[in-house]
Interface confidence: low
């Protein structure tokens, strides 16, 4: 932005500038150019020897300017167009300035003036051009500064040229008021802070409903000596509930929201939310729908899942395998987990109680992601009810629970766990164990054994203890051994069939 302090051409001859010496040299003339009257100061003393003619402007108030720009439009006639080449003719003139705090009026003193430059034309007007009224107009610009006093004068020294001064324009530059990145930068005088720092740093202020992002830099711009803004640093962002529309922040329309200061536009309220009002920072969930604390506000509101589907309990001795399928309604979420709880009931008394402490789960039962789990260490002749609950990230926000139950009665003891304790060429010492809680129900243990490959005959031994030595066996022979608990009600669960081999007669080490 240019702020004009002086414009000779615009004043249409109303500026009476001082000429020195008075009545000689520079003179104000009117001419017609393009059917318009134009005013100019001209001088053309080219045959009168050395010249020293001065033209001084009126006093110009500096305003806020520190550096001024002087734009001159002028024409210079070719010295060769004068008789004899006019030996004293020149084709340049000099430009001066003087600062002062007051207007000296007609008191003109050359010594107060400082030379800015010698002004030479790029093109001179030759005779043929002049006769055809085709003058060559030159434009030159000079910069002066820094200025410190209240005002200044310019002066033009003629040293014997034929010059017409058509325009003198003095201005200073401002970086204009500007909106950039939602920040308003004030109109700023274009000044160089120093030779090494030719840019002035200007802080901007965020427009209404815009803020500096958290941890970010405030908006800064640099105003150059040429009145141009450069190198923006930092930015402002529309605050929550507002979006950028051109250079302003506008409230989100009803039905839209914005939850944080960012460059993104307002977003439409997600599914299962109530339509927001103007300038909303979030959209409330519909009744029955919720947001987990970690859910982004742009995510649809969700609800707890329905109960798991198709829960089955498959009894395997003193174990139960629970299997189920995912809920029909996931509530719109993927983060489904299952928890299993257990209740045992004594058939005789009908008394029931929790059984978490006495059973063993194949994996922790309270954050299952798979849809099956095995429960072991179940007591025989006991009724068990298992509840499988489906939960997701918003289940904790409601009191109701979504679960399915399955019941199973344990009639058998758990199969004994069998191992080979010792062996020889003719004997096998076998031991076994069952859970302590089930031992009181066992009357005897039945050990069945036979040679591998001999399907026609087998031997049975009964004992009340937890071990047996099987004698009179053949050396280097594999025997199939199974242990079964016998209860008052009949046979309990049998162990799996184990293969144990007697030692050979050649090497009888264990």
């Amino acid at each position: 932005k240019e702020v004009v302090l002086l414009d000779f051409a615009a004043m249409k001859g109303e500026l009476g500038w001082l000429t020195h010496p008075y009545g000689k040299g520079w003179d104000l003339m009117q001419n017609i150019m393009d059917d318009m009257p134009i005013y100019m100061y001209s001088v053309c003393n080219v045959v009168s020897g050395d010249q020293d003619n001065w033209l001084r402007t009126n006093w110009v108030y500096r305003e806020e300017a520190e550096r001024i720009f002087i734009e001159l439009k002028f024409t210079v006639r070719d010295c060769n167009s004068f008789p004899g080449g006019a030996s004293s003719c020149k084709e340049t003139f000099n430009l001066y300035y003087a600062e002062s705090d007051v207007d000296y009026g007609t008191n003109f003193q050359k010594r107060q003036f400082t030379k800015i430059d010698t002004i030479a034309p790029d093109e001179i007007t030759v005779s043929s051009d002049f006769e055809a009224r085709n003058v060559k107009l030159n434009v030159e610009e000079r910069m002066v500064g820094p200025l410190t006093r209240k005002g200044f004068y310019l002066a033009f020294q003629d040293i014997g040229a034929c010059v017409a001064l058509l325009s003198v324009r003095v201005y200073y530059k401002k970086c204009p008021e500007m909106l950039q990145s939602l920040a308003r930068f004030p109109e700023t005088i274009a000044v160089a802070v120093s030779d090494t720092q030719p840019l002035a740093t200007v802080a901007g202020t965020c427009v209404d409903h815009a803020v500096v992002p958290y941890g970010g830099e405030g908006p800064l711009m640099h105003c150059t000596v040429d009145g141009e803004w450069l190198v923006p640093i930092g930015q402002c962002l529309c605050q929550e509930g507002y979006e950028k529309v051109e250079d302003a922040c506008r409230a989100c329309s009803p039905g839209f929201f914005k939850s944080e200061a960012s460059e993104s536009p307002c977003l439409e309220c997600p599914e299962h939310t109530l339509p927001s009002t103007e300038g909303a920072t979030s959209c409330q969930c519909e009744e029955g729908y919720f947001r987990a604390p970690e859910d982004p506000l742009s995510m649809s509101c969700t609800r707890p899942p329905s109960a798991p589907n198709y829960l089955t309990a498959i009894g395997m001795g003193a174990k139960v395998e629970l299997r189920w399928t995912a809920p029909k309604d996931t509530g719109g979420r993927q983060d489904i987990v299952y928890s299993v709880t257990c209740e045992q009931c004594w058939p005789e008394s009908g008394e029931c109680g929790p059984c978490e402490a006495s059973v063993r789960y194949s994996e922790p039962p309270h954050a299952l992601t798979r849809t099956s789990v095995t429960v072991s260490d179940l007591e025989p002749h006991m009724n068990y009810t298992f509840a499988v609950e489906a939960r997701n990230g918003v289940s904790g926000l409601v009191t109701s629970r979504s679960f399915r139950t399955a019941s199973v009665s344990i009639n058998q003891t758990e199969p004994p766990k069998v191992r080979l304790e010792d062996r020889s060429t003719t004997s096998l010492s076998v031991t076994w164990s069952i859970p302590v809680s089930q031992q009181s129900r066992v009357w005897k243990y039945e050990v069945t054994y036979r040679k591998k490959g001999d399907a026609n005959s087998y031997n049975v031994r009964r004992t009340e203890g937890f071990s047996v030595t099987l004698d009179d066996l053949a050396p280097d022979t594999t025997y199939l051994v199974q242990v079964q608990a016998l209860t008052q009600e009949g046979q309990g669960a049998g162990s799996k069939v184990h293969e144990f081999q007697t030692l050979s007669t050649e090497g009888s080490a264990n």
């Epitope: 329309s253 009803p254 039905g255 839209f256 536009p265 977003l267 599914e271 339509p275 009002t277």
Partner: antibody, heavy 126, light 112 residues
């Protein structure tokens, strides 16, 4: 010419079902949300249901929730209202109406229901 | 009972000015939601008359104007003409209702 034409109305017994259709022409149907609005004889306008342009958001008035189903087929430029378990109080002229929601580029204003069909009459009576 | 309250009827002589009010609450008009007005000529479908509180669709004469303040809105008709005789409905949105869209009960305008 921008036009909405409803069809499918008629006389039905209480507890019965009807399916209303609304054929759209003269504009890009898939860019607009749509509504069904009804007017009982001698009464005012009552909003019935809303469906967004992509069918991702659907709303119903409490009076029809669980009985009516709104749907659309953008490929066929058609809007539908499946009405089940009809009651005598559902007797009305049913209008489909185009609804332009303010998007975040054009922002304000909210254009309201700017195009209406001529209506189709539903009578529920034994 | 409508969520938005309108007078059941208003009347005016040709050339006169009439206004129709539409009163809501803090959950609808007072919550910042837009108000639209519809005109229903006898035996015809409703027609959008004013949208976004005060905007006229093309083709609607400038005799019709809308405004909104606080929890109320109003429709003004100047230079009343015989063809203005119709039912007028206001419509807005209510955050407390499942579907959010609400109409006024309607106002019958009679040109005397």
């Amino acid at each position: 010419e921008v036009q909405l034409v409803e069809s499918g109305g008629g006389l039905v017994q209480p507890g019965g079902s009807l399916r209303l259709s609304c054929a759209a022409s003269g504009f890009t149907f898939s860019s607009y949300s749509m509504n069904w609005v009804r007017q009982a004889p001698g009464k005012g306008l009552e909003w019935v249901s809303y469906i967004s342009s992509s069918s991702s958001t659907i709303y119903y008035a409490d009076s029809v929730k669980g009985r009516f189903t709104i749907s659309r087929d953008n490929a066929k430029n058609s809007l539908y209202l499946q009405m089940n378990s009809l009651r005598a109080e559902d007797t009305a002229v049913y209008y489909c109406a185009r609804y332009r929601f303010p998007d975040f580029w054009s922002g304000y204003p909210n254009y309201g229901m700017d195009v209406w069909g001529q209506g189709t009459t539903v009578t529920v009576s034994s | 009972q409508s969520v938005l309250t309108q007078p059941p009827s208003v009347s005016g002589a040709p050339g006169q000015r009439v206004t129709i009010s539409c009163t809501g609450s803090s959950s609808n008009i007072g919550a910042g939601y837009d108000v639209h007005w519809y005109q229903q000529l006898p035996g015809t479908a409703p027609k959008l008359l004013i949208y976004g509180n005060s905007n006229r669709p093309s083709g609607v004469p400038d005799r019709f104007s809308g405004s909104k303040s606080g929890t109320s809105a109003s429709l003004a008709i100047t230079g009343l003409q015989a063809e203005d005789e119709a039912d007028y409905y206001c419509q807005s949105y209510d955050s407390s209702l499942s579907g959010h869209v609400v109409f006024g009960g309607g106002t019958k305008l009679t040109v005397l």
